[in-house]
């Protein structure tokens, strides 16, 4: 059954309540310099209402704090609203390291990034940190690497090991979750100049991660025992037409292109999807293609192979797909599948269909293929036209979460967080922020925070509250001492 | 800022062979990027010819392959187009540019050489 | 090799005018395509690339647009400086190949 009634239950004590930002761009100057200025100034208030230095006397300043950048404090300020207790967002790339080596590294940008993880935590909230984070209109990465063929160059793979690794090193001891890649099975919108170059760059991609995980593994785990993966974009997908079988395959192989992609070297093979190679190989061999996915070496396969240590999935969706047999040598083409928008569903304005028990289903399909692991929903919202009373996305929330609550509760699903996106909207971009692109809060955030202080949908009597061991597991000392390091 | 300059004769005889190039500035030739040839005819249509990459790789248009060879020196950040045995019908002005096809701007000749008119004659 | 068509050959438009340039490609190229403005005895320069992307220091005037086979480009309140021959060239599969041109005149 596609829908099933509403369930009373809560979600466990350890679980992330989140929210996600995208690239977090890093303010180059604290923007309250009033308090490094030593000297002493009188006000001519009523002559010229300058101000005048007073020679000879100079005063204690005192040293620059975190809250001096504005960008942070509005930050706190709209988080604290929200209640959560974590904050995925992501780094600059190009901006901690504008040349793509460790030749020039932006020591003001990693301060800023630093004081929002540490100022977050003093608000009890943890951060989730994206190394990368590339949109459709700009790849983010450094220029150098930028014009050197980007992701189809295999040395940028090293180069983001090299980011990474600073990265880990900088701010590691306060940072548990870690992303390195969010949505790489998304950059086929950008490397579609042909299919071979969607598959090496995606290749270069894996292969980057894969790199990145090993180095923390190795360097990085022992001391800051935190956990990296990568986040997947991981829309469910359903047959337009059920009762037809070429629908049905076409919905499984919607998964296999967009999902199994990446999941399948990372978290089972080392290499890619049998399902998804032959079916390429298939249509090269008729002449619908020149496509074929990379052969994967023994030695790429033990580097690709295990290198997560949860799974991360960004979910907002559920497409309706049927097969329809493309020519071209495109991945687009080379997955024969047509996408159908079904117009009595609710939908957003940007047309994503609200569908809840699309997120039941992934969630299940993924723990079948991929064993049980834990997962998180790294970011999952919709886009809403309403500044203030925010329906859309209170009903989107409230439905999404009965059916993740239903994953973890009657499917056993090792679900263990969830974080909606996302914190503020940015201008003449669809609307899916809690709030508007000047910091004015919607009607969502006090749903959200119901759900979060209920810990899901709980019976009349139970309790909401967890031990406080469960709930700050954090060693407060060592919390203390880490937020005093310059 | 990145400047292309070229240099080469403006004319040459029948099955000679016609050497341009085109000296960068402002930019490493070895950094980035794609370099290119592209000529335009006395009627103005315009011809992509071939380049060479930041990292000395190749590609010639197909219906010149055979005719066409472009290096670099790295030392002195030149690129050099050679063509073979040239005919009336190479006669036109010939351009150097900076591609990047795989960044922002996409597929695109952002900076071009100042032109170098060429006419093949006896 | 991937055929350009552009369309119309030559233009004549009054200052302040909004004028527009079409190009049709032989195949679909998705967004992969670029405009210059080449004008009289001067070298072709980048105007606008993946169909719609406007280059660094190009007026906000100029406006590209169009996926898969057909394309435009939009001037809107013409300029004198705006007289020249303009060329699209698709960037999706090697060769890169260019549209004839079409060249605008003033009235």
């Known amino acids: 059954k596609e829908s099933t009634p509403d369930v009373q239950g809560q979600f466990p004590c350890d679980f992330s309540w989140g929210v996600t930002e995208s690239v977090l761009k890093p303010e180059s100057v604290a923007s309250s310099p009033q308090f490094s200025d030593p000297h002493l100034y009188v006000w001519n208030a009523t002559g010229n209402r300058l101000l005048h230095r007073v020679e000879g006397v100079r005063l204690k300043t005192r040293p620059a704090q975190c809250t001096d950048f504005v960008n942070i404090k509005k930050q706190l300020e709209m988080l604290a609203r929200m209640k959560v207790t974590h904050y995925r967002f992501a780094l600059d790339w190009a901006s901690v390291l504008p040349t793509g080596n460790l030749s020039a590294v932006n020591r003001q940008a990693l301060r800023y990034y630093r004081c929002v993880v540490s100022e977050g935590l003093k608000l009890g909230i943890s951060a989730m940190v994206t190394l990368y984070y590339p949109t459709h209109a700009h790849l983010g990465l450094p220029e150098p690497l930028l014009h050197a063929d980007g992701w189809l160059n295999p040395s940028t793979a090293e180069a983001f090991q090299a980011y990474a690794g600073l990265c880990f090193q900088e701010l590691g001891d306060l940072v548990k979750l870690w992303i390195t890649i969010n949505e790489p099975n998304r950059l086929s919108d950008i490397y579609n100049r042909s299919g071979n170059d969607t598959y090496g760059a995606a290749h270069n991609l894996l292969v980057a991660h894969a790199l990145a995980w090993r180095l923390y593994d190795r360097q990085f785990r022992p001391s800051q025992r935190g956990a990296v993966s990568l986040s997947l974009h991981a829309d469910w997908a359903e047959p337009a037409n059920p009762y037809a079988d070429s629908h049905w395959r076409a919905a499984e192989r919607f998964l296999q292109f967009e999902i199994a992609w990446f999941a399948e070297p990372l978290f089972k093979t080392g290499d890619y999807p049998a399902a998804m190679r032959e079916y390429i190989a298939s249509k090269h061999r008729r002449g619908l293609s020149s496509s074929a996915l990379p052969r994967l070496t023994e030695a790429e396969r033990r580097l690709l192979k295990g290198t997560v240590d949860f799974c991360a999935l960004n979910h907002f969706t559920t497409r309706f797909v049927m097969h329809e047999q493309l020519a071209g040598s495109r991945y687009d083409s080379d997955r024969d599948i047509q996408f159908l928008q079904d117009i009595t569903r609710l939908s957003s304005p940007t047309r994503l269909a609200v569908i809840p028990w699309g997120v039941r289903k992934l969630l299940r399909w993924v723990r079948r293929n991929y064993g049980d692991m834990d997962i998180y929903i790294t970011a999952s919202g919709i886009d809403d036209q309403a500044l203030e009373d925010d329906r859309l996305r209170k009903y989107y929330l409230g439905k999404y979460l009965q059916e993740v609550l239903k994953a973890y509760l009657i499917d056993k699903v090792r679900i263990k967080g969830y974080y909606a996106f996302k914190l503020a909207e940015e201008k003449s971009k669809p609307r899916f922020g809690f709030f508007t692109s000047d910091f004015k809060a919607k009607s969502s955030i006090q749903f959200y925070n119901k759900v979060i202080s209920s810990r899901g949908f709980p019976f009349e009597n139970s309790s909401s509250r967890c031990s406080q061991t469960q709930e700050n597991t954090e060693c407060t000392v060592c919390l203390f001492l880490v937020q005093k390091k310059p | 800022e990145v400047q292309l300059q070229q240099s080469g004769p403006g004319l040459v005889k029948p099955s000679q062979s016609l050497s341009l190039t085109c000296s960068v500035t402002g930019y490493s030739i070895t950094s980035g990027y794609y370099w290119t040839w592209i000529r335009q005819f006395p009627g103005n249509k315009l011809e992509w010819m071939g380049y060479?990459?930041?990292?000395?790789?190749?590609y010639y248009n197909p219906s010149l392959r055979n005719r066409i060879s472009i290096t670099r020196d790295t030392s002195k950040n030149h690129f050099f187009l050679k063509f073979y045995s040239v005919t009336a019908e190479d006669t036109a002005t010939y351009f150097c540019a900076r591609g990047d096809y795989y960044a922002s701007p996409y597929g695109a000749m952002d900076s071009w050489g100042q032109g170098t008119s060429v006419t093949v004659s006896s | 090799d991937i055929v350009m068509t552009q369309s119309p050959s030559s233009l004549s438009a009054s200052l302040g005018d909004t004028i527009t340039i079409t190009c049709h490609a032989s195949?679909?190229?998705?967004?992969?395509l670029s405009w210059y403005q080449q004008k009289p005895g001067n070298v072709p320069q980048l105007l606008i690339s993946k169909s719609s992307i406007l280059h660094t220091g190009v007026p906000s005037r100029f406006s590209g647009g169009g996926s898969g086979t057909g394309f435009t480009l939009t001037i809107s309140s013409l300029q004198p400086e705006d007289i020249a021959t303009y060329y699209c060239q698709q960037g999706l599969s090697y060769p890169f190949t260019f549209g004839s041109g079409t060249k605008l005149k003033i009235k």
């Open positions: 195949q679909d190229i998705d967004v992969w």
């Open positions: 060479i990459k930041y990292d000395g790789g190749n």
